[in-house]
């Protein structure tokens, strides 16, 4: 009103939602008698008396503040218990004589809103979008006043940049009062923001001061064509027989294209498509030499039907073939000589080994074994291996068989075996040669021979344990064109005396037979446990 | 007040092309997406397809190939064609407004029945 | 994809109870999770967003929690109205819906 005093400006209050605002009257004395107040809550410009003051007791009026309020500090201050977002208003005391003065003050609420709730885009952005796409939406619930948003990229505000980002910010007001402020995010994005981190920041004030709260960071699927394809091989490295081997399209396009593997075919100069699984992954497994070639990409854009090639890829599948070994089947005299000469070919330079079978002994680096002065012994197996250095595991076996010629050659010669009388009892007796021997017993018995290999064989005679045979014993003779030999297994029955705790028994010395074409077998020891052989 | 309703034939021959229309109303299909959902008899709800405010168009990739979605903002209409319908695409179609700040669907057409049968 | 699993598929309870259903997310969706509601011959309504936010007009009975992969709709004390199909649907990679919750009267 023209010609009035100015007001003073009301004194600051600042609260936050659910405390208690304390409403301290600053009429001095000289303006009015603090034992004499009446205050006012003022809401758009109109004056409603919420409180009353008489001889220092306060006396709440009807309506909203009615339990809401209390008188402290002997009377000097008002007392808002669970502010709310409504309460931000002036509120002013008014003395009663001398003169009648107001004190006003300006009640500020405040409250944090909740963290912020960020939602993705959850079908993607292509890049080549016409417009702003939505990337991101940000809610922050029940703050006040209104708090700010700021959208932040890889850590740094984003601001907006026409046709390039757009914000897009609105609030509601909940039954509370409170404010609900949401906003979205659009921006036209390039490849390179398919790692890009987005987040939002809610900016607001409590009476500490300012404050803010970001959201959880967010990467926004990015669509974008592919430019450039290529092949992978798994593993990496040398390749060879017998592995698994993935063959792999990859492209810099998101979502990937459809894929399709040709392998190009050297006879007739066209490429051929391969079968891929359902993630267009060609499978060699097992890998072979054939899988071996140029090998090639294509990527189809199944919205605009353009398609890529990838740069050709060679395939190498190493390989060693089967190993030869010549002769495939020698035979010699004794005292002779051999030479076996290994051969294999494949992708790698190769390397030989000659083994012996039953030790694995190596007895020779290099394609060829040469054997002189060739003794019984020498007979059996000689195994080549040809491998490749630079790969390992990748090698083929032969083994070939050397027999020498000869009369049978007994295992044993003599033999005691333990028995019960009337037992069946269970005899081997095994003799080698070449060629191969036949075992005859000369007791009747049920008798069956096998092969343990082609010049060994290995008889087994099941007999009843009687007084004549426990006498005599049991011979069993190997022959071939060239001889026979003999072995002799003595029969002894078992007593309390001879099952001592460390018994055992000695062979007898080997002798030679009879036979005109044989020479006898090695002197030989043998021990054996005090049992029988076999209980009937 | 915000509505979408769908229109098209009740019947389609397996194998024919199937083309839906969503008509809105109470907003501006530049300022909310729309989805198209179905539901087989009996069955649970399926996200078909979706053009964003911008225009921008995704589609389910189980049925991407067979799918044209489109919009024609001064009609206030969302057209879907389906390609190569089977019997197992009967189902009652909707169309669904995303809401302007969030990923969910707070308006739904009330639905087209689409029988596919010879 | 991302598979969303509802349990149970169909529950039996009475006006005034305190009805649960839960969701489970094949992975992580953070709170990207809706619940609508859906009456016979009816297009689905949009009860809970953001995984506890109520929409604007459904009734506070009706409360939403969870968050990574497991989340869960609360109706506490049912009434006549509420006897319906739920369904919660992920908005965290595209858009995929559980397979119902039938609620009947017992």
């Known amino acids: 009103v023209p010609g009035e005093a100015e007001q003073p400006a009301p004194e600051l209050v600042e609260v936050e939602v659910g405390s208690t605002a304390l409403l301290k009257c600053g009429l001095s004395q000289s303006q009015g008698n603090l034992s004499h107040v009446d205050w006012f809550s003022v809401h758009k410009e109109k004056r409603t008396l919420i409180f009353r003051v008489r001889q220092g007791q306060g006396q709440s009026e009807p309506g909203e503040y009615e339990q809401r309020l209390s008188l402290q500090d002997r009377g000097a201050t008002l007392a808002l218990t669970q502010v709310t977002p409504q309460d931000e208003r002036i509120f002013l005391c008014q003395g009663k004589r001398p003169r009648s003065q107001e004190y006003r003050i300006q009640l500020r609420v405040y409250k944090a809103p909740e963290e912020p709730n960020i939602q993705v885009n959850p079908l993607g952005i292509p890049v080549n979008s016409k417009e702003p796409e939505e990337v991101a939406t940000c809610v922050g619930r029940n703050g006040y006043p209104i708090p700010q948003v700021i959208w932040y990229k890889n850590g740094r505000p984003l601001k907006e940049e026409k046709n390039r980002v757009h914000i897009q910010s609105s609030q509601t007001v909940e039954s509370s009062g409170l404010y609900t402020l949401q906003s979205i995010l659009k921006a036209q994005l390039v490849k390179e923001d398919k790692d890009a981190q987005f987040y939002c920041e809610l900016n607001y004030r409590l009476p500490s001061g300012n404050h803010m709260k970001e959201s959880r960071e967010v990467t926004v699927p990015v669509f974008y064509p592919t430019e450039k394809v290529w092949l992978e091989v798994e593993p990496v490295g040398m390749l060879k027989e017998g592995d698994r081997v993935e063959i792999r399209c990859l492209a810099d396009g998101n979502p990937p294209p459809h894929f399709s593997i040709s392998k190009g075919n050297p006879s007739t100069r066209e490429a051929e498509e391969e079968t891929t699984n359902d993630n267009g992954v060609l499978v060699l497994e097992p890998a072979r030499k054939e899988h071996s070639g140029r090998y090639e990409c294509q990527a189809w854009n199944l919205d605009t039907m353009i398609s890529l090639l990838s740069e050709p890829q060679e395939l190498l599948v190493n390989y060693v073939s089967d190993v030869r070994v010549s002769p495939a089947a020698p035979e010699r005299q004794e005292g002779s000589s051999l030479t076996l000469t290994c051969e294999a070919e494949s992708s790698q330079d190769l390397e030989f080994q000659w083994l012996r079978e039953e030790t694995d002994q190596v007895l020779e680096r290099g394609p060829v074994l040469q054997l002189h002065d060739l003794k019984r012994e020498a007979g059996g197996g000689y195994r080549c291996v040809a491998s490749v250095p630079s790969i390992p595991g990748l090698n083929r076996t032969q083994l070939v068989k050397l027999a020498i010629f000869g009369p049978p050659w007994m295992a044993f010669k003599e033999r005691k075996v333990w028995v019960k009388e009337n037992m069946v009892l269970n005899l081997s007796c095994e003799a080698s040669g070449h060629p191969r021997p036949t075992i005859s017993w000369n007791v009747n018995g049920t008798a069956s021979e096998g092969d343990q290999d082609p010049q060994r064989v290995l008889s087994t005679l099941n007999v009843l344990v009687t007084p004549e045979l426990l006498e005599t014993g049991v011979e069993c003779t190997a022959s071939n064109d060239l001889g026979k030999n003999t072995s002799i297994l003595f029969l002894e029955l078992v007593n309390l005396t001879t099952l001592t705790p460390d018994s055992n028994t000695t062979t007898g010395l080997s002798t030679s037979t009879a036979s005109p074409h044989t020479r006898a077998n090695s002197t030989s020891t043998e021990r054996k446990l005090p049992e029988p052989e076999s209980r009937g | 007040q915000v509505t979408l309703k769908e229109s098209g034939p009740v019947l389609v021959k397996p194998t024919e092309t199937l083309t839906l229309t969503c008509t809105v109303s109470g907003f501006s299909l530049t300022s909310n997406g729309v989805s198209w959902v179905r539901q087989p008899p009996g069955k649970a709800l399926e996200w078909i397809a979706a053009?964003?405010?911008?225009?921008?168009?995704y589609y389910n990739s189980a049925f991407k190939s067979r799918l044209t979605i489109s919009r024609d903002t001064s009609k206030s209409q969302v057209v879907l064609t389906m390609t190569n319908m089977d019997p197992v695409d009967t189902a009652t179609y909707y169309c669904?407004?995303?809401?302007?700040?969030?990923?969910?669907?707070?308006?739904w057409g009330q639905g087209t029945l689409v029988t596919v049968s010879s | 994809d991302i598979q969303m699993t509802q349990s149970p598929s169909s529950l039996s309870a009475s006006v005034g109870d305190r009805v649960t259903i839960t969701c489970k997310a094949s992975q992580n969706i953070y709170n990207s999770l809706a619940w609508y509601q859906q009456k016979p011959g009816k297009a689905p309504k949009v009860l809970i967003f953001n995984a506890n936010s109520l929409q604007t007009g459904v009734p506070s009975r009706f409360s939403g929690s969870g968050s990574g992969t497991d989340f869960t709709l609360t109706i506490s004390s049912l009434q006549p109205e509420d006897f319906a199909t739920y369904y919660c649907?992920?908005?965290?990679?595209?858009?995929?819906f559980g397979q119902g919750t039938k609620l009947e009267i017992k």
């Open positions: 669904a407004r995303r809401y302007g700040y969030g990923w969910y669907f707070d308006f």
């Open positions: 649907q992920q908005f965290y990679s595209g858009y995929t």
């Open positions: 053009i964003s405010s911008g225009g921008t168009t």
